[in-house]
């Protein structure tokens, strides 16, 4: 027997649809109606014929009441050909549910998102996560996407992005995002954060993650910071192959003082980066190649310095380092 | 409309045995986590056992109080759910609520309630 | 066991003002960015009704007058304004962790 599309968890939490079928029957999607978290993946489908049997152009406001019903609050849809028509009616028709997070991932849109109608209502999320998502409509595609969103979002992720650089000029300012994600987007470069970090775009970000982006140098990534505006208090570079030198003719750069944690583990380091913030509440330099232990001289004044998985490091020993904490157990690195 | 009916309940001496039944519809029973949930006279909210689903291998949970004497099982064939009460105590006199679970809360439908009283 | 304490134990109120029950818990309910804290409501010879799920989701039928915050330990359900039918004792219950538990119950009456 074919298994169900969809599986239902039994405490009706969580619903996961699987469409594999050539002509799935969307209908079992029914059963997810009364779960929290729902994760719709079309098996890789072309839902271009799905325009035809719905109305896209339809007033969302005869849905207002079933849709107001729904529980959902996390949805996931994966693995499709969208076309942007229907994309923006399936918005449209949320921005009446109670949907606080949206993930999408490995979508293919084509055609571009028509402009929000006056009367139309964005939807209201907190979070909007992105992973493999390509866009008919190049770099204008965040500026598309955030007119049919109401300015609330607070947390904002962007991974292996086809064209991670936004038409700036276009994109308005998400005056309440605190996170932004940019990680696993390794052709990104600090070139292409500097394109991404539309200035002053981006005035509450507290949390900036840019993990495997290519990134060369924290000078670097510090004078994309200063050119966009974005001071961040906890930053994330873990997982790039980290230069520790910096080039004598770049400029010196000045960390935001907001900064207080910085995660440099994974970087490849075999000696601590010069230009690093003067005072941090956490830095992390776990699972890097350095060969013994930093001077005082070469760290920040730091409350909370991880140094676990190096090659220096004999599980046990401590380090001389005020404040240092370590597990004394190497870790998976 | 999901109804459940629980019913068993009943006056029983201590160390006696009582089996409760609850009787469910209006819903595809054999997907859901069931709970019994009790309050003794005057006080709070209990709750005392659950039954996962087939899917999950219909796992039990019980509450310390009455782990070793109560057994809950369930029949999705007839779309009900059991207690079996066994060596009662007379702490175990309460309001016996059969719960059914939605959106990731394990108690929004309550049946009515059957009491048991184990009284000397 | 995750031990929920409630407080205050009863609260007597003036129609149309407002009500504020808290709800601590000894470690936190959160998981995966849920708060698994539920809010419900009981009348004299009545079974319990959900009114809050998942913090701060108003059940379906609930009038708006309810509302549930809060996240990992610290969580409250307010009435506001309060009304005559809303005399009853109002629970907390989680079940993040095994065993699910209810705090021991605050009863509302109106001055």
């Known amino acids: 027997t074919t298994p169900e599309p969809c599986e239902l968890d039994d405490e009706d939490f969580r619903c996961v649809c699987n469409f594999s079928e050539p002509q799935p029957d969307w209908s079992e999607a029914f059963q997810c109606v009364s779960a929290v978290e729902v994760e719709i993946h079309a098996g890789g489908l072309n839902l271009e014929p799905f325009l035809k049997r719905v109305d896209a152009d339809a007033d969302p406001r005869q849905y207002a009441d079933t849709v107001k019903a729904l529980r959902v609050r996390r949805l996931t849809v994966g693995a499709a050909q969208v076309p942007a028509q229907l994309l923006v009616g399936a918005l449209r028709v949320l921005a009446y549910s109670r949907l606080k997070e949206l993930t999408l991932e490995d979508l293919k849109i084509t055609g571009t998102m028509p402009p929000l109608p006056l009367e139309a209502t964005g939807l209201a999320l907190s979070s909007l996560r992105l992973r493999n998502v390509s866009w008919a409509t190049g770099r204008s595609w965040l500026a598309e996407l955030q007119q049919w969103l109401k300015p609330g979002l607070k947390v904002l992720s962007i991974a292996q992005a086809h064209s991670p650089a936004f038409s700036c000029e276009q994109v308005r300012a998400f005056p309440a995002l605190t996170s932004l994600d940019l990680s696993d987007n390794p052709g990104l470069g600090e070139r292409g954060l500097m394109a991404a970090l539309c200035p002053h775009k981006f005035p509450a970000i507290q949390n900036l993650a840019l993990r495997n982006t290519g990134m060369e140098t924290p000078t670097g990534v510090c004078a994309a910071l200063a050119a966009a505006g974005v001071q961040p208090h906890s930053l994330d570079l873990s997982h790039n192959s980290l230069r520790a030198t910096v080039n004598p003719s770049a400029p010196r750069c000045m960390w935001s003082s907001a900064l207080n944690s910085l995660n440099l583990s994974f970087a490849g380091l075999e000696q601590v980066p010069k230009g690093l913030p003067a005072k941090l509440r956490v830095l992390d330099l776990s699972c890097n190649r350095l060969n013994r232990a930093p001077q005082p001289d070469e760290l920040p004044e730091v409350d909370n310095l991880t140094l676990d998985g190096n090659p220096f490091l004999v599980p046990g020993t401590a380090l001389p380092h005020e404040g240092s904490m370590n597990s004394g157990v190497v870790p998976a690195c | 409309e999901v109804q459940l009916v629980e019913s068993g309940g009943g006056l029983m001496q201590p160390k006696g045995s009582l089996k409760l039944s609850c009787a469910a519809s209006?819903?595809?029973?054999?997907?859901?986590?069931l709970n019994w949930v009790r309050q003794a006279p005057g006080t709070g909210l209990e709750w005392v056992a659950r039954?996962?689903?087939?899917?999950?291998?219909?796992?039990?949970y019980y509450a310390d109080s009455v782990k070793d004497r109560f057994t809950i099982s369930r029949d999705d064939s007839q779309n009900m759910l059991y207690l079996q009460m066994n060596n009662l105590k007379t702490e175990d006199t309460a309001m016996y609520y059969c719960?059914?679970?939605?959106?990731?809360?394990?108690?929004?439908?309550w049946g009515q309630g059957t009491l048991v009283t184990v009284s000397a | 066991n995750i031990v929920l304490t409630q407080s205050p134990a009863s609260l007597a109120v003036s129609l149309g003002q407002r009500a504020t029950i808290s709800c601590r818990a000894s470690e936190s309910v959160d998981s995966y960015g849920n708060s698994f804290m539920h809010w419900y409501q009981q009348k004299p010879g009545q079974p319990p009704k959900l009114l809050i799920y998942?913090?701060?989701n108003l059940e379906s039928g609930v009038p708006a007058r309810f509302s549930g915050s809060g996240s990992r330990t610290d969580f409250t359900l307010t009435i506001d304004p309060v009304e005559a039918d809303d005399v009853a004792t109002y629970y907390c219950?989680?079940?993040?962790?095994?065993?699910?538990?209810f705090g021991g119950g605050t009863k509302l009456e109106i001055i």
């Open positions: 039954i996962r689903s087939k899917s999950n291998n219909y796992t039990t």
């Open positions: 998942l913090a701060s």
């Open positions: 219950q989680q079940n993040n962790g095994d065993p699910y538990t």
């Open positions: 719960v059914r679970p939605q959106s990731g809360t394990s108690f929004a439908y």
């Open positions: 209006g819903f595809t029973f054999k997907t859901y986590a």
